[in-house]
């Protein structure tokens, strides 16, 4: 059986400040069940960015159609981005459970963020 | 096209032991979570078990006597029970998982069903 | 776990006529509901996800709406063939995935 894969193409991503972010992510397989959530920073202190059952985040919207069926596509933009963004981001898979188990994470994706053009 | 065709089903006394079988065709299987669904005469719909790859989830009901388990190189999605009580006499069927991406599981096909009787 | 309940258990509906029912869950599971269709001594069949979306090739009579905690069903003109039991299934929170104890659509 092949383990599943959680893909990040963009090892960096460098966005003007005001603009969108998009930060790509794919997995290699449907299974196992189970969440994929976005997190800023690695470790017990990360933050999360985006998980579409919990929480608010009125600046993150996923890429591709939420009710597209059996898409493995979990890309995210980020709008309005400001220099406190700046960060490694890690798309990151779960097994179901009680509560869900991390599975595995992308490589991570470093936004940098550069100055608005005058 | 998609099919699930089960087998196994039958008469067995209570505390006895069966095995169902759910061959699946026209999908790539491995790819997908399977499930098993039952239904009591005349009553509802309920959920019985689920498998991904390694991952494995059961119903309060059968948890501890029901074993869901698959062999992708054959297609097929098997269910062993054990210690059978009378409450467990229903039509079993296999459905295949469908998902939509940020959210959960939903079943897309379901096999025709086999019955199982717990009887003395 | 969270318990959806639909209502009415029984519907008598002429055909060509509209039908309503819904499905009412204990807590939010946001749009993460399906609705499936049975006709008597067949399997379910998909005919609703995401509380809204048609599965391919089901009648545009049917439709699918709510969101939160209610949700809807409505056949606009019934077939003959539509006279069947409706379950409702929840997929936001499990394991357990939970059913509703159906809607029986009968011929008035």
């Known amino acids: 059986e092949e383990e599943l894969q959680v893909i990040q193409p963009e090892k960096s991503v460098s966005v003007a400040a005001g603009d969108s972010a998009t930060l790509n992510c794919t997995v290699s397989s449907l299974i196992p069940v189970g969440p994929i959530q976005w997190f800023r920073g690695a470790g017990p202190g990360r933050e999360l960015i985006y998980n579409l059952k919990e929480g608010h985040f009125p600046r993150v919207t996923p890429v591709s159609d939420p009710t597209k069926r059996n898409n493995m596509d979990f890309s995210i933009r980020i709008s309005n981005i400001t220099p406190a963004d700046a960060g490694t981001y890690y798309c990151v898979k779960f097994r179901k459970g009680s509560p869900d188990v991390e599975l595995k994470s992308g490589a991570g994706t470093e936004l940098s963020v550069r100055a608005k053009p005058s | 096209e998609v099919q699930l065709l089960e087998s196994g089903g039958g008469v067995v006394q209570p505390g006895g032991s069966l095995r169902l079988s759910c061959a699946a065709s026209g999908f790539s299987f491995s790819n997908f979570a399977v499930t098993w669904v039952r239904q009591a005469p005349g009553k509802g719909l309920e959920w019985v078990s689920t498998i991904g790859s390694g991952d494995t989830y059961y119903a309060d009901s059968v948890k501890g006597r029901f074993t869901i388990s698959r062999d992708n190189s054959k297609n097929t999605l098997y269910l062993q029970m054990n210690s059978l009580r009378a409450e467990d006499t229903a039509v079993y069927y296999c459905?295949?998982?469908?998902?939509?991406?940020?959210?959960?599981?939903?079943?897309?096909?379901w096999g025709q069903g086999t019955l199982v009787t717990v009887s003395s | 776990e969270i318990v959806l309940t639909q209502s009415p258990a029984t519907l008598s509906v002429s055909p060509g006529e509209r039908a309503t029912f819904s499905c009412r869950a204990s807590q939010n599971v946001k749009n993460d509901l399906a609705w499936y269709q049975q006709r008597p001594g067949q399997a379910p069949r998909l005919l609703i996800y995401a509380a809204r979306i048609r599965e391919t090739g089901i009648p545009e009579r049917f439709s699918g709406s709510g969101s939160g905690t209610e949700f809807t069903l409505t056949i606009t003109s019934l077939q003959s063939e539509d006279f069947a039991v409706y379950y409702c299934q929840q997929y936001y929170d499990w394991p357990p995935f939970t059913f509703g104890g159906g809607t029986k659509v009968e011929i008035k």
């Open positions: 459905a295949k998982d469908s998902t939509v991406s940020w959210s959960g599981d939903f079943f897309d096909y």
